[in-house]
């Protein structure tokens, strides 16, 4: 292997090393080996256990276990404390593997049965017959026959003619092996002479035969050329006769025969004879000439090699003449004699002139196969024929060993080049590559010269190792007073506030960012911006809201700032925008009664009239409650009542009877006499006088208000219409008095009837 | 779970006998091959015979054959060792071991002392 500039014989990142004689090898990384690292190192991840030594196989990238001493198998996974080292259980010959730690399996040689293969197949006589399979089971077999067959080896066929209907339609049982046919009456066919029978249909012509029926249960086959029987059923055989030639075998075929021939003849009638020397042209073996003959083949071997294929190496040793106590090596078509120390020559007849040892400096000693005198090889810097003298390399005639120009100094055995400026190496050849030492900076790339070097620079960079770097600010690009930054190969310009680009040549509208908030107008200036702020804003981007809170407008409320704006939200009791207007919550006339209303702060109090109380004044005391109209009907009132006399009863409580007579109805002397709400008149004796009206019809003055009169001769009745009462039907029956609207319900008395008003959440005629 | 119960250990006479038995429970006595091992004061494991799962096939330590006996009873899951012609090299800590000796389940032992 020879590591050469340009040319890396190493893969997978391995290291080309020379050696000083001047061949290489490949150092491979972790994980590589082989001669050029090709082979990734099949050790690298170690699969030996229990401390097994894993080895690399170099050639094939292949590994094997090298295992401790307790310890076996591929991986050395496998204790040889295991069963199948220690007990040995696999009999007759069987093989034991190893499934685990514990257990095993045995594999049995043919003829052996069982889980140590410990039984004798008994299945291996076949004994089991009609096609029927034979298991072991300890020593003993156990067949399981086919239909048809039965007995302990199912030799024995079942007559299924025995057992009646098989066959339908009168058809004869015939018994067959392991089965049996129906042989049917004309007319009927199947199986089981269950079809009725029509000749061709279908056709019981085969191999291609044509069906004609020739009558109602007859038919005729016409067969295929090579094909006979009735119906066609017979290859006829067309081997007699054949012509097949040196051995070969007729094998009859449809209409004709093929000729099977043995493997030295070929063609239609074996005549023809097989060229082995080219179909195969390894016949012969070892170098071996194939000579083609009819009917077979021959080998010529070459020397040495024997055999109908020259396979065979002859033994020369079995001829040979080695002297006693040498080691004869058999090899093709000669034999060499391995020679005891001491002893030399091609049979070892000759003493070893090698072993006092005659050869100087190093050098290697053979003896004379022919004679016995030694020959010495020497190294190199040395001559003579026992290598004493100093070979002088600098006044070799030829030329000088020293390259570019090197001075050749003479040593003992050897020689050195001193070298000029530039080259290095044994011999001067080789030019000192001055970029080895990467002299070149930034990314300079390294030029090797004579002696040298030169660096090309990068851009932005200059000197002899590109060094330096180009200072671009020294032109001053930046412009609107920008401070310039040098970088590698550029520069980079710092722009003063409100300029930009990439030598702040731009003038930056700072308005363009809509740095003014809510609804300002924003106004460029050459270095910032400024923000003309809308109605309620301060601030520089006028994001402020100008608090209309500060000072507190709302007098009795909170006040909650909006854009220039402010809500007051007043507290109970309180109204108006800056919550200064007290409210009067007598405005409603929410007291009852003529009770009297004094506005309080979100409130109000009512001072009820006597007789009243709530707080509404919407409780009215009961003045009827201690019935003080005697003959009349109570009016409830505030703090005071009314009554509403009977017919013929007057004054405050309706207790006095009002004296009818006083008015002198009755004419003519009669005797008046006062009654309850009426009188009578006593006429005198004698005829009626009209003025003496003692029968006075009393309806005729339409006493009842709201109701029919009855009755008037001697007092009256009214029958009052519906919701009205009293005696003159002059009083609005209250329905409202057996409080008939539910769930907290208002009921306002109407005639002949009231009307509820409920309360929120409730509705229907009595707020039920 | 596997468990190995050794007995039949004691003292006994040079010359004399002794028969060590193994129940086994908690794994298909069947299936594998056993083992018995013994451990002599201050010494290290040592083998001392083994038989096959099927108890067709039995091998034993050069120290014990033609004196001891191993056999056993996959029916009554029992692994048996019978030992005649003890002597005082014999004394040891009896185990009976499935499978692998070195690396297989072991019982707790039983101590056979041979001693005049």
């Known amino acids: 292997l020879q590591c050469r500039d340009g040319y890396e014989p190493c893969v997978n990142e391995g290291m080309c090393v020379t050696y000083h004689n001047g061949t290489g090898y490949c150092k491979c990384p972790e994980g590589f080996l082989g001669e050029y690292c090709q082979h990734r190192d099949p050790c690298e991840k170690n699969r030996c256990q229990n401390g097994g030594t894993c080895v690399a196989q170099a050639m094939l990238g292949k590994a094997t276990c090298r295992c401790a001493s307790g310890f076996t198998g591929e991986d050395c996974q496998y204790s040889t404390s295991h069963p199948c080292f220690v007990s040995r259980p696999c009999l007759n010959g069987g093989t034991c593997h190893m499934l685990s730690r514990d257990t095993y399996e045995c594999t049995c040689q043919v003829g052996f049965t069982g889980k140590e293969c410990q039984w004798t197949d008994a299945c291996l006589s076949h004994p089991c017959a009609n096609g029927s399979t034979c298991t072991t089971v300890a020593n003993q077999f156990s067949c399981k026959c086919l239909t048809g067959f039965t007995g302990q080896k199912c030799e024995t066929d079942v007559n299924e003619c025995d057992i009646p209907g098989h066959c339908q339609h009168g058809g004869t049982c015939l018994n067959l092996p392991g089965s049996y046919q129906c042989q049917c009456p004309q007319g009927f066919t199947g199986q089981y002479c269950d079809s009725l029978y029509v000749p061709c249909a279908p056709s019981p012509c085969v191999n291609g035969g044509t069906c004609r029926q020739t009558g109602d249960f007859t038919f005729e086959c016409n067969c295929l050329p090579g094909f006979e029987g009735s119906t066609c059923e017979r290859n006829i055989d067309d081997c007699p006769n054949h012509r097949c030639q040196n051995g070969g075998v007729c094998v009859d075929g449809v209409n004709t025969y093929n000729c099977r021939c043995p493997p030295q003849w070929t063609g239609q009638f074996c005549t023809e004879d097989v060229d082995e020397c080219l179909l195969q042209p390894n016949a012969c073996q070892n170098g071996g000439t194939c000579a083609n003959r009819n009917g077979g083949y021959g080998c010529v071997c070459v020397n040495g090699w024997s055999g109908d294929d020259c396979s065979e190496n002859i033994d020369d040793c079995a001829f040979a003449s080695c002297t006693p106590g040498s080691t004869c090596i058999d090899r093709v078509a000669s034999f060499s004699c391995m020679c005891p120390e001491g002893k030399a020559g091609l049979l070892c007849h000759l003493d070893d002139a090698c072993i006092s040892n005659p050869c100087h400096k190093g050098a290697l000693c053979d003896t004379n196969p022919l004679n016995g005198q030694y020959i010495c090889t020497c190294p190199q810097g040395y001559k003579g024929a026992d290598c004493t003298e100093d070979v002088d390399e600098c006044a070799m005639a030829n030329s000088n060993p020293c390259e570019h120009a090197g001075k050749c100094v003479n040593t003992d055995g050897a020689f050195h080049c001193e070298c000029l400026k530039g080259y290095a190496g044994p011999r001067c050849e080789m030019d000192i590559n001055e970029c080895h030492s990467d002299p070149c900076q930034n990314d300079a790339t390294c030029l090797d010269k004579i002696g040298g070097f030169t660096c090309l620079c990068m851009p932005g960079f200059k000197g002899v190792h590109c060094e330096l770097e180009i200072n671009e600010c020294q032109s001053n690009p930046c412009v609107n007073n920008g401070q310039c930054v040098d970088k590698v190969n550029r520069f980079q310009c710092l722009c003063p506030p409100g300029f930009t680009g990439p030598v702040c040549q731009i003038d930056i509208d700072d308005c363009s960012s809509t740095p003014c908030l809510n609804g300002a107008k924003c106004i460029d200036h050459p270095n910032g911006y400024e923000c003309q702020c809308a109605t309620g804003f301060t601030g520089v981007l006028c994001e402020e809201n100008i608090d209309n809170c500060d000072p507190d407008p709302c007098h009795h409320g909170q006040c909650q700032d909006g854009i220039d704006s402010y809500t007051c939200i007043c507290n109970p009791g309180y109204m108006g925008a800056i919550c200064s207007d007290q409210i009067d919550e007598c405005y409603s006339s929410p007291c009852l009664n003529d009770g009297r209303c004094i506005d309080l702060v979100n409130g109000y109090q009512c001072n009820c009239q006597p007789g009243t109380s709530g707080v509404n004044c919407e409780i009215n005391f009961d003045d009827c409650a201690s019935n003080p109209c005697i003959h009349g009907i109570c009016m409830d009132g505030i703090n005071r009542y009314s009554c509403v006399c009977s017919p013929g009863f007057t004054g405050q409580r309706c207790n006095i009877d009002i004296d009818e007579c006083a008015s002198n109805p009755c004419r003519k002397g009669a005797t008046c006499i006062n009654g309850v709400n009426g009188f009578r008149c006593i006429c005198p004796e004698g005829p009626h006088h009209p003025s003496c009206y003692s029968q006075v019809n009393e309806c005729l003055s339409n006493p009842c208000i709201h109701g029919n009169c009855t009755g008037g001769l001697s007092g009256y009745k009214c029958l009052c219409d519906a919701g009205w009462v009293g005696i003159n039907c002059e009083v609005d029956k209250n329905e409202c008095l057996s409080n008939p609207c539910q769930n907290g319900g208002t009921c306002d008395n109407l005639v002949n009837g009231y009307r509820c008003t409920c309360k929120k959440g409730f509705k229907g005629y009595n707020c039920q | 779970e596997v468990q190995l119960v050794e007995s039949g250990g004691g003292l006994v006479q040079p010359g004399g006998s002794l028969r060590l038995s193994c129940a086994a429970s908690?794994?298909?006595?069947?299936?594998?091959?056993m083992n018995w091992v013994r451990q002599a004061p201050g010494k290290g494991l040592e083998w001392v015979s083994s038989i096959s799962a099927g108890g067709y096939s039995t091998t034993y330590a050069d120290s014990v054959k033609g004196r001891f006996t191993i056999s056993r009873d996959n029916a009554k899951n029992t692994l048996y060792l019978q030992m005649n012609s003890l002597n005082p090299e014999d004394t040891a800590v009896y185990y009976c071991?499935?499978?692998?000796?070195?690396?297989?389940?072991r019982g707790q032992g039983t101590q056979v002392t041979v001693s005049s």
């Open positions: 071991a499935r499978g692998d000796w070195r690396y297989g389940s």
């Open positions: 908690g794994f298909t006595f069947g299936d594998y091959a």
